[in-house]
Interface confidence: medium
């Protein structure tokens, strides 16, 4: 659902804060942060500012790839003396404010992970009005996204000298290992991981010799799970046929 | 599940001290901010203290300010509140509770009596 | 610091309507957030950020927020729903959280 305000309890600004009189900028952001994909996780920030009990306009930022220069994944903007703070960005709509910045909270929630979503995020507030500044985490949260392995692509190509080869591409973090088991291939498990392996969560295995008609099955495991699916290779007078 | 489960409630004469303990369970404890609410007998809830999800920020009420101190072991889930110089308007149930969209779950409370 | 006030009683038939009121300044900058209490219980956040309902809480209880007032709604009230109401919001001028003085609603 999206919030058109800010959370009022989950973050709640703090503190001894208040009553040092030299409170510096700072932001407190965790190193990592890991949940599976497809589920929700929480990019914690918070931050202590010098501007005693500010209720001016502020802006809450959260930035990823790097700082200062990485594409915003969400905005959101509040009016002097409100706490309400009004969505200007989310990307995909699956990033929301669960803190409250009033609270000197930043904390972020994102929705329905992907693999693609795995990487660092940066925590920025702006104040403007009577005071203008600003503060970004400079080091940011990492955002682990683990799944169990997906096979996205298998196929059968031609090779040189009328031979046929196998191709297995499955994503996955950990990455998966990857296994090909079928005619003449005995119960031992060929494996042959491509350059590309690890590249973007991918991991591609080649069967480079295709010697026998049948099934041949790719398997595609690690801690969280496995998949499995199979291409068949039929030959009629030099041509073939695959079907998944 | 969500569980919140206090623990260190008693007794305690005026003046004396007393540690509170949260226990969760079920979600990710150091990903989120946690308060402590009281409720005197027969009366209304009364916010006590707050705490960050890394513990950096804190803030209290008025009425515990310099008295209590709210703090939180991630590596064991567990939240504390630490009252000392309990006076006998401390009197109450006392209740842990995560902050977020509201209050969005409590635990059902340790018993705090200060008498003599 | 803001003070929430709420009535201290509220009552209504079974099936009808209640409404349970909560004022304070400049409530529509602020969260407002309501819980149910029933006796020897904890509280039970019913509606959050004004208008939001939890997981698991039916789809009578609704709540709003204008003007200097934010209220509850209970359409077709029924007899479990009778128990202590508290509304409850955050003063960033005082970095505290204010819960109102609660309602007790009686089902007729």
């Known amino acids: 659902f999206v919030r058109t305000k800010i959370d009022t309890t989950e973050n709640l600004l703090n503190t001894e804060v208040h009553s040092s009189p030299a409170q510096r900028w700072s932001m407190q952001v965790p190193p990592e942060v890991s949940a599976e994909a497809g589920d929700a996780a929480v990019l914690p920030c918070t931050f202590t500012h010098p501007h005693r009990h500010y209720d001016g306009p502020l802006t809450a930022i959260w930035r990823a790839g790097e700082p200062y220069a990485g594409p915003q994944v969400f905005r959101c903007a509040a009016a002097r003396g409100s706490e309400l703070c009004q969505t200007a960005l989310s990307l995909h709509g699956r990033f929301r404010l669960l803190g409250n910045p009033r609270r000197n909270d930043l904390s972020l929630r994102v929705e329905r992970l992907a693999l693609a979503d795995d990487r660092r995020y940066f925590c920025r507030v702006e104040f403007a009005g009577d005071v203008h500044d600003r503060y970004e985490s400079r080091h940011g949260v990492r955002l682990h996204v683990t799944a169990a392995p997906r096979i996205v692509n298998i196929s059968v190509l031609p090779s040189p000298a009328h031979a046929f080869r196998a191709l297995c591409t499955a994503e996955g973090e950990p990455p998966p290992a990857l296994a090909w088991s079928g005619p003449a291939l005995g119960n031992s498990l060929a494996a042959v991981r491509s350059p590309r392996e690890g590249h973007g969560h991918l991991v591609t295995a080649e069967l480079p010799a295709l010697t026998h008609d049948g099934r041949y099955t790719c398997t595609a495991a690690n801690s969280l799970g496995r998949s499995e699916a199979s291409v068949y290779l039929f030959r009629f007078h030099g041509a073939s046929g695959a079907s998944t | 599940q969500v569980q919140l489960v206090e623990s260190g409630g008693g007794l305690v004469q005026p003046g004396g001290s007393l540690r509170l303990s949260c226990a969760a369970s079920g979600f990710t404890f150091s990903s989120y901010a946690m308060h402590w609410v009281r409720q005197a007998p027969g009366k209304g809830l009364e916010w006590v203290s707050y705490?960050?999800?890394?513990?950096?920020?804190?803030y209290y009420a008025d009425s515990v300010k310099g008295r209590f101190t709210i703090s939180r072991d991630n590596s064991k889930n567990t939240l504390y509140l630490q009252m000392n110089s309990l006076r006998a308007e401390d009197t109450a149930v006392y209740y842990c509770a995560r902050g977020w969209g509201g209050f969005d779950y409590w635990g059902q409370g340790t018993l705090v009596t200060v008498s003599s | 610091d803001i003070e929430l006030t709420q009535p201290p009683s509220v009552s209504v038939a079974p099936g009808q309507t209640a409404r349970i009121s909560c004022s304070g300044d400049n409530l529509p900058n602020r969260y407002v957030h309501w819980y149910q209490q029933k006796p020897g219980q904890a509280p039970v956040l019913v509606i959050y950020d004004d208008n939001n309902r939890p997981s698991g809480i039916p789809e009578r209880f609704s709540g709003s927020n204008s003007g200097n007032t934010a209220t509850l709604t209970i359409s077709g009230t029924q007899a479990e729903d009778e128990a202590d109401y508290y509304c409850q919001t955050y003063d960033m001028f005082s970095m505290s959280d204010v819960f109102g003085g609660g309602t007790k609603l009686t089902v007729l």
């Open positions: 705490i960050s999800y890394s513990g950096s920020n804190t």
